[in-house]
Structures are given as C-alpha cells and as structure tokens.
Amino acid sequence: APRGTQAEESPFVGNPGNITGARGLTGTLRCQLQVQGEPPEVHWLRDGQILELADSTQTQVPLGEDEQDDWIVVSQLRIASLQLSDAGQYQCLVFLGHQNFVSQPGYVGLEGLPYFLEEPEDRTVAANTPFNLSCQAQGPPEPVDLLWLQDAVPLATAPGHGPQRNLHVPGLNKTSSFSCEAHNAKGVTTSRTATITVLPQQPRNLHLVSRQPTELEVAWTPGLSGIYPLTHCTLQAMLSDNEVGIQAGEPDPPEEPLTLQASVPPHQLRLGSLHPHTPYHIRVACTSSQGPSSWTHWLPVETPEGVPLGPPENISATRNGSQAFVHWQEPPAPLQGTLLGYRLAYQGQDTPEVLMDIGLRQEVTLELQGDGSVSNLTVCVAAYTAAGDGPWSLPVPLEAWRPGQAQPVHQLVKETSAPAFSWPWW
C-alpha cells in the first residue's frame, strides 16, 4: 500500500459513536487506529479536555511479524453509570511523529424522562403586577412539551398547547403555587413547586401635609394588597447628609434611620421631635400578612425655620459720657434657623422706646445726648431668623462708666435706623 501521504492522513479508522440513554446506563466508546510502527498511546478527550482518570483500555494487534509493520490499536472508554457529568463531546487524541491527530467526535447524552435545566423559583410579587416564570427541560428524546400548573390546576388543555419556556402571569391577588410538567416520549417529569407570595404594592404619592419647625405631617396612598388587608405601614426618616446624599431609590440608607410604625387607616403620620430648618429624606412601605411592600423612593423634605428659642446672653451695657456701649453673645438656645441678626430696644424711664435692627453685629455704640437727667435707661436684645424674633432678653440697665457722671439727654441716639418691624415692649 502506498504510504507517501500517511503522515498527513489521520491514522483513525474508527471514531467514538454516540451514546444516548437514561441515567445509570453503561456504555462503551471506541477509537480504532491503524498505524505503521510503534503504536501510540491513545488519550481520551471530553469537550476538548484530556480525561486524566478515564476508565479506558487499549488493545494493540500487530498485523505482521516485523516491528515496522502495521498495528491495529483499539481504545475503549467505558462509561459505567451514565450521569449528567458524562455528557459531552468525546474524541481520541494520539501523538504520531511530530503531529497530533484527533478523531472525529462522538457524543454522550442522556435520554429518558425530561431533565429540567430551569425550574420556577420562589419569589415575591406585588399584587396585581405582571411577572414571568421560567421553566426549561430537555430530552432526549425531543420534543419536550411543557404544561404549567397554577395551584395544581393545568393552565392549558394539553402539554405544548399553552405557554412553554416562559409563563407570563398578568397579576395575582393571592399567594399561589406554580409548577411545570415536562412531557416527552418517555414520560413526564414534574418540576419543583414555586411559591409566589403576593405582597402589597409600593405606596404611592408620599407627600407632606403640613410642616412645623420640629414636626412634619406626611400622607401617602396605599397600593393594592390583593386579598390581604394592610396591617400597618412603616415610615423611615433620615437626616439628609450632604456628604452622603441619599439617592432616589437607593436600596438602603447609609446610616440607621428613624423608623416609625403607623396604624392604617389613615395613611398619615405625624413625625415629631425633629430639628428645625433641617433637610430629611423619608420613605414608606406597607405590610400585609404576606409581608412588606417595597419602599417608596426617598422623598426629600425639610422642616421650616423657627424663631430662636432663647435670647442673646451675656449682655453688657455701659455708658461713658455721651456714648453707650452695648455688646452680647449669640443665644445658647437653638436658633431653629439661620440667624439673620439682632434687634435692640432701649428706653428711659420717661422716654419712648427706641427699636434698632443691629444686623449680625454683636455690639453697638449708641451716641447719647442729654444732661444726664434720663434715668433708668435699660437695653433689651433679641435674635431673629426668617421666622421671626426670638424672646427678648431681660432689660439690662445702662451702667455709668464713671460713677456720678451724667449728661443731659437731648437726643437719645445720634443715628438710628428705622425699625423694620414694630415691636411691643415686653
């Protein structure tokens, strides 16, 4: 026989066949070679990877007396008990000279009752909300027809007549079970049963009803909850931190929020003990016997400003000749907003009250004119925010810089700014 091109041609004269059967089947794959000279070792590949621990036997039969005559080599791979892990493409590999030769492939697969590649999974869905379930099964033998069941009731008249891989459910109002049956020529396999738990829909239209410096009243519209009445709603409030910044729809707040429960109805809740003039984020979820709805997106809200809760402190007022020097410190009590400034009022015993807006300064020099006959001159100071004035300080008497010194008071203040507001005295 001509041998000129033998090195280029595959030495294989037999390739692995196909094994298709049920789990537990025993089968044999074979490769057959005819080679000249020293017979090579046959390696088995599954899906392109060498099988290191293959249960294989290699038999070599010489076809002549001479070592350089042809040899027949038969390698048999035994599959003792067919499992899913055995499935794949099988080939033989030999090294001859400086060349690798790979046999044509054979295939091992399972045949029997359908085998599920995908089964319906337990999940939660909002009431009356569409969702999909998936089920996928394969043979062989093909075809595999699916039949979906809801609460053990078939959703089609026969396998293959209804939805197949994907079941679209337009919505549920009660917790239900779903499974699928896979039918082929060998019989029927039933998938696991998935429980679809119906939760309330996400509340809608979370909004502010009223605002006070330390209190917010919020309301929302509950979502549908199927046949299960809502038992309560949960509201979370979170101080807005500019550094963190809660994004709308962020699944979890960056720090522990304030959590409050509201009996329902009404779908309304008063949040108290808040900081004035402070940004918050709030969200709400409602719960039935089946579990909680998803949270609404975080809604940014803000408490309004309040008036300062206390007067400025450490007020001192001293008179030195025709000048009076008054200074004070910021109220220690919460300002409940942005401090816009201070108002100062002073009055002598028999003179009208004078009201001044000092702005944000914490001291003022008053130019006094007079003969010193104005007696019992007192000064009061109040802080104010956009919401209004805080409480006035107690009247502070103007003390003489030097005892006995007095000046006539013809014009009490040299320059006064017109009061922005008219305030009653105490």
Epitope: A1, P2, R3, G4, T5, Q6, E8, E9, S10, V13, G14, N15, P16, G17, R30, Q32, Q34, T59, V61, L63, D70, I72, V74, Q76, Q104, G106
Partner: antibody, heavy 120, light 107 residues
Framework: EVKLVESGGGLVQPGGSLNLSCAAS????????MSWVRQTPEKRLEWVAF????????YYPDTVKGRFTFSRDNARNTLYLQMSSLNSEDTAMYFC?????????????WGQGTSVTVSS | DIVMTQSHKFMSTSVGDRVSITCKAS??????VAWYQQKPGQSPKLLIY???TRHTGVPDRFTGSGSGTDYTLTISSVQAEDLALYFC?????????FGAGTKLELK
C-alpha cells in the same frame, strides 16, 4: 438518501483488465472511507480494497495486491477500481460500500453491484 | 489473516421464534464484529457493528453480543421478512474477512 451506483462490469478474458466505477451521492463523500467487496457465485463475501477519505491510504488483500488499484476523485464523488491480470477467481459481483464513522472497516451502505465475469 | 467461522450454513425457524446465529473468530477481535443481512437479489445490509451496536433503522428485535472470539446475532421474534442470508465480518484489521454465511429459512 445515500446512494452508490457501480458500473463498468462485464465479461473479460483471463489476463485482461477492467475498470469499475462507483458514483456516490446523498452524503459528504470526502468524509468517508470506502471499500470494494465482491461476492462469488457461491455467495461468499470477499473484501477487495480499502481507501481512506482523502485517498492517501489504500489497503488490499494479498489475493489482489499488485493487480488492483483503488482510487477516488472527491471532486466528482467517484471511486475507481482498476483491475488487471484478471483470472477466473475474480469472477464475482463487485459492490462498493461506505465505511461507518465508528469503524471504517464495517460497511453501512452498499451499492447494488456490478457483475464481472472472467472467462475465455 | 483472521478467519471467521459460521458453523451453521442453514438454520430453520418459525415466525415468532427466537433464533441465535453464531460466529467464531480465529483470534480475539476485541468486539470488532459486524453482522449483515442479505436478501435474494439485494446487496448486504448492515445490522450490527462493534458486536452490539445496532445500525440506524434496524429493528430492536436484532441484538448482537459477544466478546473475545465468540459472537452471536439474536433475533428475538423472527418475522417473515427476516428470512435471509446472514454474514458476520471482523472489522478489526485488514484484510477484512467474512464468515461463509448462515441462511435462515422456515421449518
């Protein structure tokens, strides 16, 4: 459908030559090894020749080695068996047959045969 | 050369019977045995290869078995259309060799 059609048989005198052909269709011819097998008037089957799918390997039994040449034209899907120095022992129905994928030496499809008679 | 021996030239059977046709190789052929069926005026048809692998389209009443040197073709329930000539062949190595054939006929 796999189809193999032999032709070229006939009556030939001892010592003469004959060329047989086999036209293949219905499968990827170039992927399969092929054989010629003959059946004697006594109905015995005898393997005559083997050729690999690419044509690079040919095997013959000693009874025909040196007298028969097996070749193939993959472009034309055709096999050729050139027979020379024919004798009465070569009288038979000649079949071309396709080797199986799992063993090229087992034959899964056979033609209907062409008759060769060597007689004076 | 490997000699394949079919000891029964003829076998008598009835429709519905179970019948076994045997073949013996002169040496271990590592299950490389094929079985062919030939009906009058037709070419041989492959039934079994690698001793037990049924060829595509062959009815499952035909089964092959054996190892080493001894091989058997069994027809579990003979049908009228099974009456034919059956050959074994070793497909281990060249030269390829056939048995002389067993003719299955009605009793």
């Amino acid at each position: 459908e796999v189809k193999l059609v032999e032709s070229g048989g006939g009556l030939v005198q001892p010592g003469g030559s004959l060329n047989l052909s086999c036209a293949a269709s219905g499968f990827t011819f170039s992927s399969y090894s092929m054989s010629w097998v003959r059946q004697t008037p006594e109905k015995r089957l005898e393997w005559v020749a083997f050729i690999s799918n690419g044509g690079g390997r040919t095997y013959y039994p000693d009874t025909v080695k040196g007298r028969f040449t097996f070749s193939r034209d993959n472009a034309r899907n055709t096999l050729y068996l050139q027979m020379s120095s024919l004798n009465s022992e070569d009288t038979a129905m000649y079949f071309c047959a396709r080797g199986t994928t799992e063993s090229y030496y087992a034959m899964d499809y056979w033609g209907q045969g062409t008759s060769v008679t060597v007689s004076s | 050369d490997i000699v394949m021996t079919q000891s029964h030239k003829f076998m008598s059977t009835s429709v519905g019977d179970r019948v076994s046709i045997t073949c013996k190789a002169s040496q271990d052929v590592i299950t490389a045995v094929a079985w062919y069926q030939q009906k009058p005026g037709q070419s041989p048809k492959l039934l079994i290869y690698w001793a037990s692998t049924r060829h595509t389209g062959v009815p499952d009443r035909f089964t092959g078995s054996g190892s080493g040197t001894d091989y058997t073709l069994t027809i579990s329930s003979v049908q009228a259309e099974d009456l034919a000539l059956y050959f074994c062949q070793q497909h281990l190595s060249t030269p390829l060799t056939f048995g002389a054939g067993t003719k299955l006929e009605l009793k």
